[in-house]
Interface confidence: low
């Protein structure tokens, strides 16, 4: 069962799945100047048998330039950034995803893929949040969100995370900033397209802040 909407947005935070449940789909998106090959897969699908899980289908991109031109398409600045596919080395990773039954690892990059990945999550998927560079986490509970099926409807649990600027003066108890509502965005804004972005190891994140690769900007 696909999740009906996106994981909640937390200001100044990004989320990442450490592993993907069987049934998850990843769109085969190509960067500017490239397109999927004809008869190429529209998406990769996490599937499994009794012993292991893996991604079905392969994404392939080809230049969308006309055949009789040799002009090389120059990537835009944000597309020149090398894609980080290594998993975030962080305490928030609960288990070694390679040993997690019923889940696929992060798929390896394919040539000329888009700068962000669009996943279609399924019920039971968990994503983990961390604050972007320059913000620190105030935890009131788990910095994670789970897509749950309750009474026939899917919903994401609300992560208990607030990201506060390093320079912001700390607030007095009881004077917390208002948080997003537990139910996330209004129904009119929901979508089945879920975009997760490359998590940067914290020390690397500063370099990426100027050219944002995030589909959603967290203001």
């Amino acid at each position: 069962e696909l999740c009906d909407d996106d994981p909640p947005e937390i200001p100044h935070a990004t989320f990442k799945a450490m592993a993907y449940k069987e049934g998850t789909m990843l769109n085969c998106e190509c960067k500017r100047g490239f397109r999927r090959i004809k008869s190429g897969s529209l998406y990769m699908l996490c599937t499994g048998n009794s012993s292991h899980s893996s991604w079905d289908n392969q994404c392939q991109c080809t230049s969308s330039a006309t055949r009789n031109t040799t002009k090389q398409v120059t990537p835009q600045p944000e597309e020149q950034k090398e894609r980080k596919t290594t998993e975030m080395q962080s305490p928030m990773q609960p288990v070694d995803q390679a040993s997690l039954p019923g889940h696929c690892r992060e798929p390896p990059p394919w040539e000329n893929e888009a700068t962000e990945r669009i996943y279609h999550f399924v019920v039971g998927q968990m994503v983990y949040y961390q604050c972007v560079q320059g913000y620190r986490a105030l935890h009131r509970g788990p910095a994670e969100s789970v897509c749950k099926m309750t009474h026939g409807k899917t919903r994401w649990t609300q992560p208990q995370l607030i990201c506060t600027g390093e320079m912001e003066t700390s607030q007095f108890p009881g004077e917390e900033k208002p948080q997003a509502s537990p139910e996330g965005r209004p129904e009119s804004e929901t979508s089945c397209l879920v975009t997760t972005t490359d998590f940067q190891i914290q020390t690397e994140m500063a370099a990426t802040m100027e050219t944002s690769i995030f589909t959603t900007e967290y203001q």
Partner: nanobody, 127 residues
Framework: QVQLVESGGGLVQPGGSLRLSCAAS????????MGWFRRAPGKEREFVAV????????EYTDSVKGRFTISRDNDKNMVYLQMNSLKPEDTGVYYC????????????????????WGQGTQVTVSS
């Protein structure tokens, strides 16, 4: 998928003990929080206890705290409920259940959050 089979129920006198076992099959067992629920005659199914997938926390309904202990053995795919100082009001069918969310930190006492259920084992406390 997770399949669950309970055992260990029976007739016991007040003040006695029983140990319920829940055998789980399915390769995702170790990623699910596991709970015990019970249904007394003529009553709604009620939460008894839950243990987290990584065995680092447990929760109990108030009426069994200090008397019941939930545990699990992920190597054997087993969940247990040790019931001591049993009372007549503990009588009912006991069900083992697996949270339908792997790796969840939300140890819910709500039956709707549990996607996998056993058939139940009868516990009768009577003199």
């Amino acid at each position: 998928q997770v399949q669950l089979v309970e055992s260990g129920g029976g007739l016991v006198q007040p003040g006695g003990s029983l140990r319920l076992s829940c055998a789980a099959s399915g390769r995702t067992f170790e990623t699910h929080n596991m709970g015990w629920f019970r249904r007394a005659p003529g009553k709604e199914r009620e939460f008894v206890a839950v243990i987290s997938w990584n065995v680092d926390s447990t929760e109990y309904t108030d009426s069994v705290k200090g008397r019941f202990t939930i545990s699990r053995d992920n190597d054997k795919n087993m969940v247990y409920l040790q019931m001591n100082s049993l009372k007549p009001e503990d009588t009912g069918v006991y069900y083992c259940a697996a949270d339908n969310i792997p790796l969840s930190s939300d140890m819910s006492p709500t039956a709707a959050e549990y996607g996998y259920w056993g058939q139940g084992t009868q516990v009768t406390v009577s003199s």
